[in-house]
C-alpha cells in the first residue's frame, strides 16, 4: 500500500507512517515504527503538556512569585499550566499576568466607573454636573449633591465636581 500523506486526528506523519500523538500530560520518548507503538512518558512534577503532542520536553509550570504581587489562582497539573492572579488591591500588567501593579485611584472630581479586578485596572469617570467626589479612591463612585430642598433648606454654596453643595436655613420674610 502507498504511504499515507495525511493522518487521522491525534496522529502525526513520520517516516511515511502515521504514529499516535502523546496524550496531554505526556511527552514523546520515541516515534512508532512498523512494529512498535509511539512511546510516551508522563511529565514530571511541576511540568505539563496541555495538548495531544509530539513534544520531547514538557513545559515548566509558571511560578506565581509572591514578591511580584502574584498568587496562584489555579494550581498546575500534568495537563494544565498554573494560572496566576494578583493579590488583593493589585492587578496584572499583561494577559500572561507575569507581574502586578497597584490599582489606580480616582482623583477628587472623578469617581469609579468600574472597580478593578485581578486582571483589570480601575476605570474612572469625571463627575458630571450634580455629582461630586472629594476623595482619591479606588472604590468610591461620584456622589450626588445634597438636595437642600428636601431638607427645607436653601443652597448657600454651589457644589462642584469636587465638593458638595452647602445648605443653609431659608431667610425668614420679616413682617
Amino acid at each position: 500500500p502507498e504511504p499515507p500523506t495525511a493522518c487521522r486526528e491525534k496522529q502525526y506523519l513520520i517516516n511515511s507512517q502515521c504514529c499516535s500523538l502523546c496524550q496531554p500530560g505526556q511527552k514523546l520518548v520515541s516515534d512508532c515504527t512498523e512494529f512498535t507503538e509511539t512511546e510516551c512518558l508522563p511529565c514530571g512534577e511541576s511540568e505539563f503538556l496541555d495538548t495531544w503532542n509530539r513534544e520531547t520536553h514538557c513545559h515548566q509550570h509558571k511560578y506565581c512569585d509572591p514578591n511580584l504581587g502574584l498568587r496562584v489562582q489555579q494550581k498546575g497539573t500534568s495537563e494544565t499550566d498554573t494560572i496566576c492572579t494578583c493579590e488583593e488591591g493589585w492587578h496584572c500588567t499583561s494577559e500572561a499576568c507575569e507581574s502586578c501593579v497597584l490599582h489606580r485611584s480616582c482623583s477628587p472630581g472623578f469617581g469609579v466607573k468600574q472597580i478593578a479586578t485581578g486582571v483589570s485596572d480601575t476605570i474612572c469617570e469625571p463627575c458630571p454636573v450634580g455629582f461630586f467626589s472629594n476623595v482619591s479612591s479606588a472604590f468610591e463612585k461620584c456622589h450626588p449633591w445634597t438636595s437642600c430642598e428636601t431638607k427645607d433648606l436653601v443652597v448657600q454654596q454651589a457644589g462642584t465636581n469636587k465638593t458638595d453643595v452647602v445648605c443653609g436655613p431659608q431667610d425668614r420674610l420679616r413682617a
Epitope: C43, E45, S46, Q74, T80
Partner: antibody, heavy 119, light 113 residues
Framework: EVQLVESGGGLVKPGGSRRLSCAAS????????MHWVRQAPGKGLEWVAY????????YYADTVKGRFTISRDNAKNSLYLQMNSLRAEDTAVYYC????????????WGQGTLVTVSS | DIVMTQSPDSLAVSLGEKVTINCKSS????????????LTWHQQKPGQPPKLLIY???TRESGVPDRFSGSGSGTDFTLTISSLQAEDVAVYYC?????????FGGGTKVEIK
C-alpha cells in the same frame, strides 16, 4: 516501600528557632514535590508550605510567611523546614508529605514530629 | 482563600451501615483546562498520619477498598462508605487541591454505634 521520616521536633521557647528534617526513601526523591502540613493537638490539618521537585517553585501559608523557610537537598533525599520567631500557635505535629506529578495530591505522609512552643 | 466546610463534625454508625460525609468549598474546584475537580479525601486513624483515600473527587487511591466512593462537582462533594467496617473508624478530611493555599475541611469523626 515509600518512607518519610520527620525529625527535629521538641520544646522551643516563644521567639526561638527550630529546623525540622524529613528523610525520604523508597522512591526517587528528586521527582516529587514536597509539602509540610501541621496539626495542632486535637485539631485539624493545616497546610504550611510546598516546594517543587526541582526547587524552582515555593509557596507558603500566610500564617508562616516570612518566618518559615522550606528547602530540600535532592542529593541527600531530604526536606527541611526552618522555623524562626516561633509562637505558641505554631505548636503542632509537623508532617512532611509527597506530591507526585500525576495526581497532584499528597499521596504519602510521614509519621510527624511534635514541636511545642512554650516558655 | 478557599474555605472547606465539612458536615457532620462526627457521627456514630452501626457496622455494615452506610456513612455519608459532606464537604462544601467556598469556590469551585473545577480545573478549567482538564475538567477535573481537584477535591481530595484523606483518612486519619487514631494515632496515625493521614492517608490519601480519594483524589480528583472520585478516583480511589490504589489499595483503597471499593466501599469508599467519592462524588460531586464544583463546590459540593460527598464521601460515602457503603458498609462501615471496624477498621474505618477515623477522622476524614476533605481538601482543596485546586489552588494555594491548600485548605482542609475541619474533619468528620466516624465512630461505631
Amino acid at each position: 516501600e515509600v518512607q518519610l521520616v520527620e525529625s527535629g521536633g521538641g520544646l522551643v521557647k516563644p521567639g526561638g528557632s527550630r529546623r525540622l528534617s524529613c528523610a525520604a526513601s523508597g522512591f526517587t526523591f528528586s521527582d516529587y514535590g514536597m509539602h509540610w502540613v501541621r496539626q495542632a493537638p486535637g485539631k485539624g490539618l493545616e497546610w504550611v508550605a510546598y516546594i517543587s521537585s526541582g526547587n524552582r517553585i515555593i509557596y507558603y501559608a500566610d500564617t508562616v510567611k516570612g518566618r518559615f523557610t522550606i528547602s530540600r537537598d535532592n542529593a541527600k533525599n531530604s526536606l527541611y523546614l526552618q522555623m524562626n520567631s516561633l509562637r505558641a500557635e505554631d505548636t503542632a505535629v509537623y508532617y512532611c508529605a509527597r506530591q507526585d506529578g500525576y495526581r497532584y495530591a499528597m499521596d504519602y505522609w510521614g509519621q510527624g514530629t511534635l514541636v511545642t512552643v512554650s516558655s | 482563600d478557599i474555605v472547606m466546610t465539612q458536615s457532620p463534625d462526627s457521627l456514630a454508625v452501626s457496622l455494615g451501615e452506610k456513612v455519608t460525609i459532606n464537604c462544601k468549598s467556598s469556590q469551585s474546584l473545577l480545573n478549567s483546562g482538564n475538567q477535573k475537580n481537584y477535591l481530595t479525601w484523606h483518612q486519619q486513624k487514631p494515632g496515625q498520619p493521614p492517608k490519601l483515600l480519594i483524589y480528583w473527587t472520585s478516583t480511589r487511591e490504589s489499595g483503597v477498598p471499593d466501599r469508599f466512593s467519592g462524588s460531586g462537582s464544583g463546590t459540593d462533594f460527598t464521601l460515602t462508605i457503603s458498609s462501615l467496617q471496624a477498621e474505618d473508624v477515623a477522622v476524614y478530611y476533605c481538601q482543596n487541591d485546586y489552588t494555594y493555599p491548600l485548605t482542609f475541611g475541619g474533619g468528620t469523626k466516624v465512630e461505631i454505634k
